[in-house]
Amino acid sequence: HTAAQDNCTCPTNKMTVCSPDGPGGRCQCRALGSGVAVDCSTLTSECLLLKARMSAPKNARTLVRPNEHALVDNDGLYDPDCDPEGRFKARQCNQTSVCWCVNSVGVRRTDKGDLSLRCDELVRTHHILIDLRHRPTAGAFNHSDLDAELRRLFRERYRLHPKFVAAVHYEQPTIQIELRQNTSQKAAGDVDIGDAAYYFERDVKGESLFQGRGGLDLRVRGEPLQVERTLIYYLDEIPPKFSMKR
């Protein structure tokens, strides 16, 4: 696993403990909470990050209208079960044996049940809509400059391949970033759109997951872009199954 050799830290995940005791005496970083060794050359999966977090001492129609099946994470934080690759297990349960099914970004997609609840597969979230409101500025940002800056951010900071940033919509003060990534499109080594969205969300909230880097300093043509609200919608390849309209 790659990690900064000089002082043995994980540039892409500060919620790790690193020591020079990996294979061959190399630096190895383990996610807090789970102890899973992480690859510090890329983003850590959201499931491992959420587990680490829980273990820590604790409009006009140019904008996209979220699909009726879009999920918003209303349940908040929980201590998830992750599989050996760090992905969310399809079925999550709490301490009181209440269980539910989640999608690939860990958001509940069924009613809650008991231990008999079956979640046959981990359903992939293939479309993420990040809805931002920026603080008032002297004037609106230039759309194409904003588009270019956000695409650069996802490419350089989150290492997300540009083809997965489907669109950037803007109508002052609302910005919408659409990320799309089907199962068939995601190659080995590609950053998952869910992980990129989670890192971005933590960045705009001033809770950066990167080690030692300054917080997110987003500028469009030198003008600071300061986010005052974030809402994220998740669309799954298979629509969620709730017993009634939410």
Epitope: S19, G25, P84
Partner: antibody, heavy 117, light 107 residues
Framework: QVQLQQPGAELVRPGASVNLSCKAS????????INWVKQRPGQGLEWIGN????????NYNQKFKDTATLTVDKSSSTAYMQLSSPTSEDSAVYFC??????????WGQGTLVTVSA | DILLTQSPAILSVSPGEKVSFSCRAS??????IHWYQQRTNGSPRLLIE???ESISGIPSRFSGSGSGTDFTLTINSVESEDIADYYC?????????FGGGTKLEIK
Amino acid sequence: QVQLQQPGAELVRPGASVNLSCKASGYTFTSYWINWVKQRPGQGLEWIGNIYPSNSYTNYNQKFKDTATLTVDKSSSTAYMQLSSPTSEDSAVYFCSSYRSDGFAYWGQGTLVTVSA
Amino acid sequence: DILLTQSPAILSVSPGEKVSFSCRASQNIGTSIHWYQQRTNGSPRLLIEFASESISGIPSRFSGSGSGTDFTLTINSVESEDIADYYCQQSNSWPFTFGGGTKLEIK
């Protein structure tokens, strides 16, 4: 060479706490995890938990979370495990070990803890 | 927690024979498995790390193989000094866990 020194035996009264020590030498103490392992007579090995001396980050096997407390003293390169309110179930040999890579390459001789009135 | 199941509980072989110890994990752990030998009243000794990597000072008759969920420790020509208990241990995630052990006896 790497050495982990543990006292041979400790006799403890039921309910009284005991502090087991593990003194490391021959390597950079702060750079490698110290693990604690329990072995009851005639039984297998059981991982209690570990501590990273550099920042005292600890992990525990849930089974031992309420009875074992792991600490280190960096100045003396010594790791400690406190067993609180021990019962006869805690009578066992307790090993400390350190690992190079993830295998526990270095082991102490073990401390035999006897809980008896 | 990751469960490690070792089989058989006891192995009885004659000197010079080849012997294999099995360790099965309850989920995929890649190659994050390590093997130990523990002689009577002694401390465990690391034999093999990361499923198949040899440890300096350990006789070459000890070897390991496997990945994912199934792992094997092999002694290709057993000697009388190999009488001991053998344990596998996983370091894929916390809590680290050990298998129940296999006792090697010499006929």
